[in-house]
Amino acid sequence: MKALSPVRGCYEAVCCLSERSLAIARGRGKSPSTEEPLSLLDDMNHCYSRLRELVPGVPRGTQLSQVEILQRVIDYILDLQVVLAEPAPGPPDGPHLPIQTAELTPELVISKDKRSFCH
Amino acid sequence: MKALSPVRGCYEAVCCLSERSLAIARGRGKSPSTEEPLSLLDDMNHCYSRLRELVPGVPRGTQLSQVEILQRVIDYILDLQVVLAEPAPGPPDGPHLPIQTAELTPELVISKDKRSFCH
């Protein structure tokens, strides 16, 4: 599987997340349609449903076994790790900030009377 | 959970990955100790072993149920998505920001205060 390349400042891994997945992430882990109590966390099926929503390429309608879902989860984590293991591009420098004129050292001011003869 | 902050050009999400985990990621799914064919991934136990290797905070020695492993996997995926949704560090002066970064749409920025519980 190829590494995910930057697309418009984000990455395919992120850009291909469904709006639904992003909405769930924003909603502190709550699916928009359900407000279930924490006790249901122990239900394995809920975890698989959650993974289906989070991982691109695991659409809800498809019939995937738990093993197939886990395989796609593993692939997705590997892709995210590969992208993040490469440092983000950075700028060459910060903005140019002038030295305060009052603090200019003598060496930085070229005197006009030393411009005439080649020593 | 707090947002993952840049650390020396990489991110805590990556920095906290064990060397082994990164080596696995670079090897595109091959554990350093085993060169198993992909067919073995069909075994559910192999998938969980693999996830234990890939996800920080799921050490091999600990006794975690499959549900607990999946919960940590979900948390980790959400964290990686959050980091990738954040634009790369840029120069402090706005006008010089490259178009890619400046064009990041709000929908791509995932809220940082999410928790992943399997709802």
Partner: antibody, heavy 111, light 111 residues
Framework: QSVEESGGRLVTPGTPLTLTCTAS????????IHWVRQAPGKALEWIGY??????TYYASWAKGRFTISKTSSTTVDLKMTSLTTEDTATYFC???????WGPGTLVTVSL | AVLTQTPSPVSAAVGGTVTISCQSS????????LSWFQQKSGQPPKLLIY???KLESGVPSRFKGSGSGTQFTLTIIDVQCDDAATYYC????????????FGGGTEVVVK
């Protein structure tokens, strides 16, 4: 406003060495600091920088052997490992914008 | 990226004009992130021009920078004896490493 390098000395190959850039008249929390070196009679060579926020970037040749870190609001270190004779040079630090440079500190790597 | 400067040395007469070129193998950041420095023996570099054409404070207006993208020029008009030095261009790039690269330097000899 000025910067000054220190820590340069004669070392044998393989010896690690740490140089320090000390800022006067401004805080490093607001500026990038660059490290640049110049071998005798050779061109300037950019090593890397640490940003105001602490992010570091390096020349590809310097990655792994050179580490830049902020040690206080007025000091930045350049840690160098696995030094060879090729690393003999005057090492400069420069403030963001490259408009303030230190006088440089000489590092000599010799047997 | 690689920055290639006019071969050294370049000779000029007092009152004459000197042109030094700097070519980058890839476009600099923002198409203008290129600086020029003057360095005299035993001294740190001194910033003359930044962002291709902006004159640093205290630098005589005889120094002019121009160019865009990959091709840049430093022009010194009404050359003075004090201009005898080595001149370096510095390209900046938005990248994961080698964010700043110096040219090889051009020595200017004033006759």
């Amino acid at each position: 406003q000025s910067v000054e390098e220190s820590g340069g000395r004669l070392v044998t190959p393989g010896t690690p060495l740490t140089l320090t850039c000390t800022a006067s008249g401004f805080s490093l929390s607001s500026y990038y600091i660059h490290w640049v070196r110049q071998a005798p009679g050779k061109a300037l060579e950019w090593i890397g920088y640490i940003s105001d926020g602490g992010t570091t970037y390096y020349a590809s040749w310097a990655k792994g052997r050179f580490t830049i870190s902020k040690t206080s609001s007025t000091t930045v270190d350049l840690k160098m490992t696995s030094l060879t004779t090729e690393d003999t040079a005057t090492y400069f630090c420069a403030r963001q914008g490259f408009n303030i440079w230190g006088p440089g500190t000489l590092v000599t790597v010799s047997l | 990226a690689v920055l290639t400067q006019t071969p050294s040395p370049v000779s000029a007469a007092v009152g004459g004009t000197v042109t030094i070129s700097c070519q980058s193998s890839q476009s600099v950041y923002n198409n203008n992130w290129l600086s020029w420095f003057q360095q005299k023996s035993g001294q740190p570099p001194k910033l003359l021009i930044y962002e291709t054409s902006k004159l640093e404070s205290g630098v005589p207006s005889r120094f002019k920078g121009s160019g865009s993208g990959t091709q840049f020029t430093l022009t010194i008009i009404d050359v003075q004896c004090d201009d005898a030095a080595t001149y370096y261009c510095l390209g900046g790039y938005w990248t994961t490493s080698d964010n700043n690269i110096f040219g090889g330097g051009t020595e200017v000899v004033v006759k």
